[in-house]
């Protein structure tokens, strides 16, 4: 039977099925994610040379994809609770659109896509539960993010498989750099 | 909702070999990430292994190179593969179910193995 997130289990009779903690299951939640971009990146690499692009060829790229800073609080040096958590949801908050951008941009692995798009947003409640500073966190403007999906849409082919494979690295870059601060936390 | 059954558990010698079997019913076995924990008395719950959906493993230190996860998609199992068994593997092994897309776990009741001469 399920344990819903943040309840006991009521089977006295089991002292291990007690549920996961708020750290694990976030632990979890990210690498549930990671995996799913794992697999979009296999089909993206095997479908264009994206993968081999020198990294300055990618560094001209204009997208504004999050990135964690120094000043961000998430590094050792620097290490900041509060202020690295709501650089990591405000982070998650601002893939999301890029994120919906890779709903039709994949052939057999539709389903991953949509994997990695779901579980963000269930990782992005989990974080604000943890949250105390709620306010701090800024929420994308949907008007700015509609445009933007639209300008993406427009791009030619060469373009949006650049675009695919820059937010399928940069999101997992964000997500690595989320899961080693969190375990900090 | 997800039912997950555990068995292969049982008194095994040390030195010896057992395989942990985790029939999960439900139809989005393909999207759960999939792991087998162990409790033994009075001690924390431990992670043992994990595998993902696509197949990627981890195993805990205490248990590399001994104990090898695995699943079949088609059949909705995992495995438990325990070779080279200690006393201190003694506990009740969980098998736990992770969808990413609800963050619900979902877990076993158990099967008991012990390792003793």
């Known amino acids: 039977a399920p344990v819903p997130p943040g309840e006991d289990s009521k089977d006295v009779a089991a002292p291990h099925r007690q549920p996961l903690t708020s750290s694990e299951r976030i632990d979890k939640q990210i690498r549930y994610i990671l995996d799913g971009i794992s697999a979009l990146r296999k089909e993206t690499c095997n479908k264009s040379n994206m993968c081999e692009s020198s990294k300055e060829a990618l560094a001209e790229n204009n997208l504004n994809l999050p990135k964690m800073a120094e000043k961000d609080g998430c590094f050792q040096s620097g290490f900041n609770e509060e202020t690295c958590l709501v650089k990591i949801i405000t982070g998650l908050l601002e893939f999301e659109v890029y994120l919906e951008y890779l709903q039709n941009r994949f052939e057999s692995s539709e389903e991953q896509a949509r994997a990695v798009q779901m579980s963000t947003k269930v990782l992005i409640q989990f974080l604000q539960k943890k949250a105390k500073n709620l306010d701090a966190i800024t929420t994308p403007d949907p008007t700015t993010n509609a445009s933007l999906l639209t300008k993406l849409q427009a791009q030619n082919q060469w373009l949006q498989d650049m675009t695919t494979h820059l937010i399928l690295r940069s999101f997992k870059e964000f997500l690595q750099s989320s899961l080693r601060a969190l375990r900090q936390m | 909702a997800v039912q997950l059954v555990e068995s292969g558990g049982g008194l095994v010698q040390p030195g010896g070999s057992l395989r942990l079997s985790c029939a999960a019913s439900?139809?989005?076995?393909?999207?759960?990430?999939m792991d087998w924990y162990r409790q033994a008395p009075g001690k924390q719950r431990e992670l043992v292994a994990s595998?993902?959906?696509?197949?990627?493993?981890m195993a805990a230190d205490s248990v590399k190179g001994r104990f090898t996860i695995s699943r079949d998609n088609a059949e909705n199992m995992v495995y438990l593969q325990m070779n080279s068994l200690k006393p201190e593997d003694t506990a009740v092994y969980v098998c736990?179910?992770?969808?990413?897309?609800?963050?619900?776990?979902?877990w076993g009741r158990g099967t008991q193995v012990t390792v003793s001469s």
């Open positions: 595998i993902s959906r696509s197949g990627t493993t």
């Open positions: 439900g139809s989005i076995f393909s999207r759960l990430a």
């Open positions: 736990m179910a992770f969808d990413g897309y609800s963050g619900s776990d979902y």
